[in-house]
């Protein structure tokens, strides 16, 4: 259960940091 | 929150102009803009933008022919020497994708 | 470069159909997601559709549905209606020293 919330969360994540770089323009981390 | 675009004219071939974006709502600390022009009857194409610490990015085919600059409340495009294929509709727009926010657009007419 | 490619075009629709608009991209869009749909209809700016391949943008109805991945994307309209009458743009997004986000050439859908 607790793979399944870690897994979730870092989709949450991923598609916020997506959106942040989309409003901002700045470069991806490596 | 919106954005305005203002400038657009009649100007003969080699005049260089420059186009305003203004932006209300929110700061350009916080976001990107972009340039998408639009030719009559034609598609969108996308020119470039500038980034939360000013730095500006081109379409390869823009290198050159546009410099994209910004001040705390307006972004700029400045076409440096224009030809009649310039003549376009010109759209700002908030962020370098997912563009959620755009301009009417100003139209510019380059003739001689 | 990356280069985005819309087919068909025109699309005919009748009321309460259905219209699939394809777009490919010529390499994967970055993180295989950065791809965005746009709505425009004369005399206006595009208008944000969907982003991230099938996210729904604020206040756009669920008859509109975004598919695929890396290089092939589909957006779906069901029920369409004759407010669904303008040309669709889709936008793929790379990064090389720079954001790249050009846009395909538009597919226009005509409502009957």
């Known amino acids: 259960r607790k793979n399944l919330q870690d897994f979730a969360a870092c989709g949450i994540d991923r598609m916020n940091y997506d959106s942040y770089l989309a409003q901002t323009g700045k470069s991806p981390a490596k | 929150q919106s954005v305005e675009e203002s400038g657009g004219r009649l100007v003969t071939p080699g005049t260089p102009l420059t186009l305003t974006c203004t932006v209300s709502g929110f700061s350009l600390s916080r976001y990107a803009m972009s340039w998408v022009r639009q030719a009559p009857g034609k598609g969108l194409d996308w020119i470039g933008y500038?980034?939360?610490?000013?730095g500006a990015y081109y379409a390869s085919w823009a290198k050159g022919r546009f410099t994209i600059s910004e001040t705390s409340t307006t972004v700029y495009l400045k076409v440096n020497s224009p030809t009649t294929e310039d003549t376009a509709t010109y759209f700002c727009a908030r962020g370098v994708a997912n563009s959620d926010i755009w301009g009417p657009g100003t139209l510019v007419t380059v003739s001689s | 470069a990356l280069v985005m490619t819309q087919t068909p075009s025109p699309v005919s629709a009748a009321v309460g159909g259905t219209v699939t608009i394809n777009c490919q991209s010529s390499q994967s869009v970055f993180n295989n997601k950065w791809l965005s749909w746009y709505q425009q209809k004369p005399g206006q700016p595009p208008k944000l559709l969907i982003y991230?391949?099938?996210t729904l943008a604020s206040g756009v109805p669920s008859r509109f549905k975004g598919s695929g991945s890396g290089t092939q994307f589909t957006l779906t309209i069901s029920g369409v209606q004759c407010d669904d009458a303008a040309t669709y743009y889709c936008?793929?997004?790379?990064?090389?020293?720079?954001?790249?986000?050009?846009f395909g050439g538009g597919t226009e859908v005509v409502v009957e």
């Open positions: 991230f391949v099938s």
């Open positions: 500038i980034d939360i610490g000013g």
């Open positions: 936008q793929g997004s790379d990064y090389s020293s720079g954001w790249y986000s050009p």
